[in-house]
């Protein structure tokens, strides 16, 4: 507020108290509470008489600066006002108030009292900004499937409330809501989405901003959405490769998942062959009898399903003229 | 309960000294600071000067400087007043008091009164 | 120094009437807020009892037919109804700056 000069003085002062409506620091920081008198060269401050502004109490002195006595700070202050440090102006009435909490939040008055032009006072606010430590909480575990899902939920308290929103590609909804406290509130914001498996591995970003921060503060959460591939067997793709003695064949089974999927082989009509090796996805064969013939079955599952692929392997004997002839249409 | 209990009245020969004591109880002492009153006969009050219990600093009516010396114990809670160079001019009563709890302003407690007697 | 001047010097008022007590500061002591005036109250032989702060907040305890109002430089202390037990010297005391002073007094008779 503007300064407001004692009436009835009597005399034609320019005097004037420059001081801040409002003040903001940081908690933890020094709060410097501004009151220059700024009047004539021959005019002397004699004493600043500082206080906290109850509205229903009355007024709490945090500390006097006298120009004969110094600064004597009242006990419920001590250790915690004190002037700018030098060099100071003997018409600055401003003090230090050390380590700002939240406490400290309220209206605060200078009372100047000079010679000869008599009494100023000013009041101000001072506003202590608490900024918020955010935290990001993931939802349940995202499934491939399910409908509108939490993927995570953000909370940030502080003073005055936080600003809390999401920095991501992934389609989806947020939501907010805000808890007021005595001194502060919390904001807590939910994103959710529809989980699919094109958003596996994808940032979703909580971005706080609050006049506290230097620069908003972001945590990432990476998704992870549970799913599992149908499967498919890869290898028979050309029939004639089949044949007795061919080396090297093999059967892979296709599909992907999240987590990793494990995978196993079995065959329909018995036991897998002698020679026939499992090595994770592939089954390998050793050269080709007629005996590896069979319905042969690829098994794929995680911690959220299963799948499975059946394929029939039909090994072609050259020397078998009943095959020569399927062999030849077949072609 | 706050009390403020200050010590015996005093009678004293002109040019000599006397100190008066205010001993509080019933609240933290060095957490308000302690102001002495006087109050010449049938005559208003005057105000003498407070001390700071938490750290001793001390500031003087100018009436009073020279006349006055504040200091306190705290270990024992209790506030001193040395009246100095005594004439009768300062035959009196003087009163420790106290702000109240919501405020720093206006003295809510106030001891009892030390009457000193200055006298040949 | 502000210098306090209060009126009358003394005052007779009949039981159960209006006291009014004037107290008038040599500069002005509100600021927005409050304004930095108290009015005690001292019976003889008894240290004086805070009745008013800032100007017009009944201490508590003070029963509320004490009440006290103004700002800037001219304040008032009003008793009323008056009763017997209000037999005695009202002060009022500025608290804007160093020295705090106090008025003259004014003695309260009830007849």
């Known amino acids: 507020g503007k300064p407001i000069p004692n009436p009835l003085l009597g005399l034609d002062s320019t005097g004037e108290l420059e001081t801040s409506d409002l003040v903001t620091v940081v908690l933890g920081q020094d709060a410097k509470l501004p009151c220059f008198y700024r009047g004539d060269p021959d005019e002397q401050v004699g004493q600043v008489a500082w206080a906290r502004v109850d509205p229903n109490e009355g007024t709490r002195e945090l500390a006097l600066l006298h120009s004969k006595y110094g600064l004597h700070v009242s006990p419920a202050y001590e250790d915690r006002v004190e002037q700018p440090p030098p060099p100071r102006d003997p018409l600055d009435g401003s003090i230090l108030l050390r380590n700002a909490v939240q406490a400290d939040e309220g209206e605060y008055e200078c009372r100047v009292s000079t010679f000869p032009a008599g009494s100023f006072q000013a009041r101000m606010r001072l506003r202590v900004l608490v900024p918020p430590l955010p935290s990001l909480n993931p939802g349940p575990p995202l499934e491939e499937g399910q409908g509108l899902t939490l993927a995570a939920s953000c909370t940030a308290e502080g003073s005055p409330a936080p600003s809390v929103t999401w920095d991501t590609e992934v389609k989806g909804t947020q939501s907010s809501r805000s808890f007021k406290h005595s001194r502060s509130a919390a904001v807590t914001s939910e994103f959710h989405l529809v989980p699919s498996r094109s958003m596996n591995g994808q940032p979703l970003t909580c971005v706080v901003s609050h006049p506290g921060l230097l620069q908003d503060q972001r945590i990432t959460h990476t998704l992870q959405v549970a799913f599992l591939a149908e499967a498919s067997v890869r290898g028979l793709e050309d029939q004639n490769l089949w044949h007795v003695g061919r080396e090297g064949a093999t059967l892979k089974c296709l599909s992907e998942g999240q987590p990793p999927p494990k995978y196993n082989w079995t065959r329909l009509d018995g036991p897998l062959p002698s020679g026939v090796r499992v090595k994770g996805d592939t089954l390998g064969f050793p050269p080709l009898t007629t005996e590896h013939s069979g319905v042969y079955v690829c098994h794929v599952s995680n911690e959220l399903s299963s799948r499975a692929s059946q394929v029939t392997v039909e090994v072609l004997d050259p020397e078998d003229p009943g095959k020569q002839v399927d062999l030849v249409s077949a072609s | 309960e706050v009390q403020l209990q200050q010590s015996g009245p005093e009678l004293v020969k002109p040019g000599a000294s006397v100190k008066i004591s205010c001993k509080t109880s019933?609240?933290?002492?060095?957490?308000?600071?302690i102001h002495w009153v006087k109050q010449n006969h049938g005559k208003s009050l005057e105000w003498i000067g407070r001390i700071n219990p938490k750290n001793g600093d001390i500031i003087h009516n100018q009436n009073f400087m020279g006349k006055a010396t504040l200091t306190v114990d705290k270990s024992s809670s209790t506030a001193y007043m040395e009246l100095r160079s005594l004439t009768s001019e300062d035959s009196a009563v003087c009163y420790c008091?106290?702000?109240?709890?919501?405020?720093?302003?206006?003295?809510?407690?106030w001891g009892q009164g030390t009457l000193v007697t200055v006298s040949a | 120094d502000i210098v306090m001047t209060q009126s009358p010097t003394s005052l007779v008022v009949s039981l159960g009437q209006r006291a009014t007590i004037s107290c008038r500061a040599s500069?002005?002591?509100?600021?927005?807020?409050?304004?930095?005036m108290h009015w005690y109250q001292q019976k003889p032989g008894q240290p004086p009892k805070l009745l008013i702060k800032y100007a017009s907040n009944l201490e508590s305890g003070v029963p509320a037919r004490f009440s006290g109002s103004g700002s800037g430089t001219d304040f008032t202390l009003n008793i009323h109804p008056v009763e017997e037990e209000d037999t005695a010297t009202y002060y009022c005391?500025?608290?804007?700056?160093?020295?705090?002073?106090f008025g003259g007094g004014t003695k309260l008779e009830i007849k």
């Open positions: 019933g609240y933290t002492f060095t957490e308000y600071t």
């Open positions: 008091a106290r702000s109240g709890y919501g405020s720093s302003y206006g003295f809510a407690y």
């Open positions: 005391q500025h608290s804007w700056e160093i020295p705090y002073t």
């Open positions: 500069q002005s002591v509100t600021t927005p807020r409050y304004s930095y």
